[in-house]
């Protein structure tokens, strides 16, 4: 296989919709940003499809993606972050479509890890935490984070939580007692960057205590 | 048509500061990239410094680094180039550019002069 379709080929994929997005990382894996683009419509024939961008890097005009299954990958220290680079599906040497995009409004932060949650008898309340690799970068330091939670039996029933530190308090009285509750979070740029929420990091499961008859107080576990 | 119009050159001695403006009437200003060139007499153009539509990504070149700090006030459709350490080798034309596309800057302005006696 050469990459380069036929003519037959290149008539076919003109007819075809090769929508696509993307999301960017930044400081992903120590200096290095990466940049992940996926078609819309997942029955698109990849076959002799490539992706590249152009313009708004550092020492070179243009880079191709890594096909990696479904998607598009690059990872480099190239990316200038500043203006717009041009992100074309290409089949052969002709581009199929293209658009026009700025790196630092598509970001996709790095999802929240350690959450736990930690059940304080004497304040009757129960603290979350959790934390994020976005603390230690250069670029994208600030976020809103979204905590949800559930009691496990209520299969969509998630209160959600928009927080900008990583420590949430719940007051115990807000819970139901003797139930087991499911939590996550996930986070989104805030100031500076614009973006997409992170994947959700795992779920932490915590049960809330029996309610003390004598005193309408929830039993510690 | 964008308008972006400079301001604050002048006379200055070596070792001194002066800080550019560079006001802009683009209705997207707050999205666009923007940046600073010189251009001295007989010379070609040279990049000095660019900056992000919301100014947490900047990049200087090699010859002004350290001495020059370009920021930006999108409420004021604005953005500066501070100048400290001037040395009589950055008399030049000043000129600021908006929008940067795929590597083509698609707005300029006319420009103000600097110079730095000795």
């Known amino acids: 296989e050469s990459g380069y379709a036929q003519n037959g080929d290149l008539e076919d994929a003109e007819l075809d919709d090769y929508s696509f997005s993307c999301y960017s990382q930044l400081e992903v894996n120590g200096s290095q940003h990466s940049l992940t683009c996926a078609f819309e419509d997942p029955d698109v024939n990849i076959t002799n499809l490539e992706f590249e961008i152009c313009g708004a890097l550092v020492e070179v005009k243009c880079l191709n993606f890594r096909k990696l299954q479904e998607i598009y990958f690059i990872e480099t220290k190239k990316f200038l972050l500043i203006g717009k680079s041009n992100i074309c599906v290409k089949v052969g040497e002709k581009s199929l479509t293209c658009k026009k995009i700025d790196l630092t409004t598509i970001v996709k932060p790095e999802a929240p890890f350690d959450l736990s949650v930690v059940y304080r008898e004497g304040a009757n309340d129960f603290v979350v935490t959790f934390n994020t690799s976005h603390l230690q970068k250069k670029y994208v330091k600030v976020l809103m984070h979204d905590v949800a939670y559930r009691q496990e039996k209520d299969e969509n029933k998630w209160t959600h939580v928009n927080l900008s530190s990583t420590k949430l308090t719940l007051l115990q009285r807000k819970l139901q007692p003797a139930a087991m509750y499911e939590i996550k979070v996930r986070s989104i740029p805030d100031h500076y960057f614009k973006g997409f929420w992170s994947e959700w990091s795992p779920s932490y499961y915590f049960r809330t205590p029996e309610i003390n008859n004598s005193s309408g107080e929830m039993d510690p576990i | 048509e964008v308008q972006l119009v400079e301001s604050g050159g002048g006379l200055v001695q070596a070792g001194g500061s002066l800080r550019l403006s560079c006001e802009s009437s683009?209705?997207?200003?707050?999205?666009?990239?923007m940046g600073w060139f010189r251009q001295a007499a007989g010379k070609e153009r040279e990049f000095l410094a660019a900056?992000?539509?919301?100014?947490?990504?900047?990049h200087y070149g090699d010859s002004v680094k350290g001495r020059f700090t370009i920021s930006r006030d999108n409420a004021k459709n604005t953005v500066y180039l501070q100048m400290d350490s001037l040395k009589p080798e950055d008399t030049a034309v000043y000129y600021c550019?908006?929008?940067?596309?795929?590597?083509?800057?698609?707005?300029w302005g006319q420009g103000t002069q600097v110079t730095v006696s000795s």
């Open positions: 683009a209705r997207t200003f707050s999205d666009d990239a």
């Open positions: 900056i992000n539509w919301s100014g947490a990504v900047t």
């Open positions: 550019a908006e929008d940067y596309d795929t590597d083509v800057w698609q707005h």
